[in-house]
């Protein structure tokens, strides 16, 4: 049966929990959950010296 | 072939409680997530929830409007899909559909009637 | 909760002709890293129940046939019927699942002359 892709992840860290296709992997929460939950970093401005925010849920890229 | 059967519709009274069930065949149950959807004669459809599949813990969400009252299971052993529905009300009647998650709502029962009416 | 509207609430065409039905959602429903629309389209014919036509707003199900087209993205979509057969009489309802709750149209209301 044809799943959600599974992204490779670090050496010592757990699999991911495989998502259908309706629903995306929150890295830092480790479970899936509607795309529209995980927020992508903004891109940096030109010349900003600190990295973007990042926020609770993460998606696996 | 996927089939969805859904049961354990009928009448009830206000503040009653009723257990729906769908029974599934065609697929391995465990690998796949399950929802509840829905439909107010002439109406629109709506979403109840899901239930997600054992490699998720079979963990639930729910739409807010139900929260608290209906509660989504499953009997992996034989197939079974459920929704309990407690402290039913006159506007919780309506067909009601399971159906399999995937891309979206995949496939779907042929649904069951459920009437709340003193 | 993202409000999904539809439009029309009904339309009339006859065998052959072209329609084209509108959904609109009062939020976005693209999903910037892969670059999907979680948006779904449903056909309900008479007296039966919902049947997957469309997911991903654009992405024909499996034996779905080909004048079924859907497009759009963001907030913005529409199903296209290329060349309608009488069997296509049904309410057609679009969906997203973008987040929870999953809400869906109100439906457009399919009839032949």
């Known amino acids: 049966m044809r799943r959600g892709p599974r992204s490779l992840r670090g050496r010592d860290a757990p699999a991911p929990t495989p998502c259908v296709p309706a629903e995306c992997f929150a890295l830092l929460v480790r479970h899936c959950v509607a795309c529209g939950l995980l927020r992508t970093p903004r891109p940096k401005p030109a010349g900003a010296s600190s990295p973007a925010p990042r926020t609770a849920l993460q998606p696996q890229e | 072939e996927v089939k969805l059967v859904e049961s354990g519709g009928g009448l009830v009274q206000p503040g009653g409680s009723l257990r729906l069930s769908c029974a599934i065949s065609?697929?391995?149950?465990?690998?796949?997530?399950m929802s509840w959807v829905r439909q107010p004669p002439g109406k629109a459809l709506e979403w109840l929830g899901f239930i997600r599949d054992k490699a998720n813990g079979y963990t639930t969400e729910y739409n807010p409007s139900v929260k608290g009252r209906f509660t989504i299971s499953r009997d992996n052993s034989q197939s079974i899909f459920y929704l309990q529905m407690n402290t039913l009300r006159a506007e919780d009647s309506a067909t009601y559909y399971c159906?399999?998650?995937?891309?979206?709502?995949?496939?779907w029962g042929q649904g069951t009637t459920v009437t709340v009416s003193a | 909760d993202i409000v999904m509207s539809q439009s029309p609430s009904s339309l009339a065409v006859s065998v052959g002709e072209k329609v084209t039905m509108s959904c609109k959602s009062s939020q976005s429903l693209l999903y910037s890293s892969n670059q999907n629309n979680y948006l779904a389209w449903y056909q309900q014919k008479p007296g039966q129940s919902p049947k997957l036509l469309i997911y991903?707003?654009?992405t024909r199900e499996s034996g779905v046939p080909d004048r079924f087209t859907g497009s759009g993205s963001g907030t913005d979509f529409t199903l296209t019927i290329s060349s309608v057969k009488a069997e296509d009489l049904a309410v057609y309802y679009c969906q997203q699942y973008y987040t929870y709750p999953y809400t869906f149209g109100g439906g457009t209301k399919l009839e032949i002359k």
């Open positions: 159906a399999q998650v995937r891309r979206a709502l995949d496939y």
């Open positions: 991903w707003a654009s």
């Open positions: 065609g697929f391995t149950v465990t690998a796949y997530y």
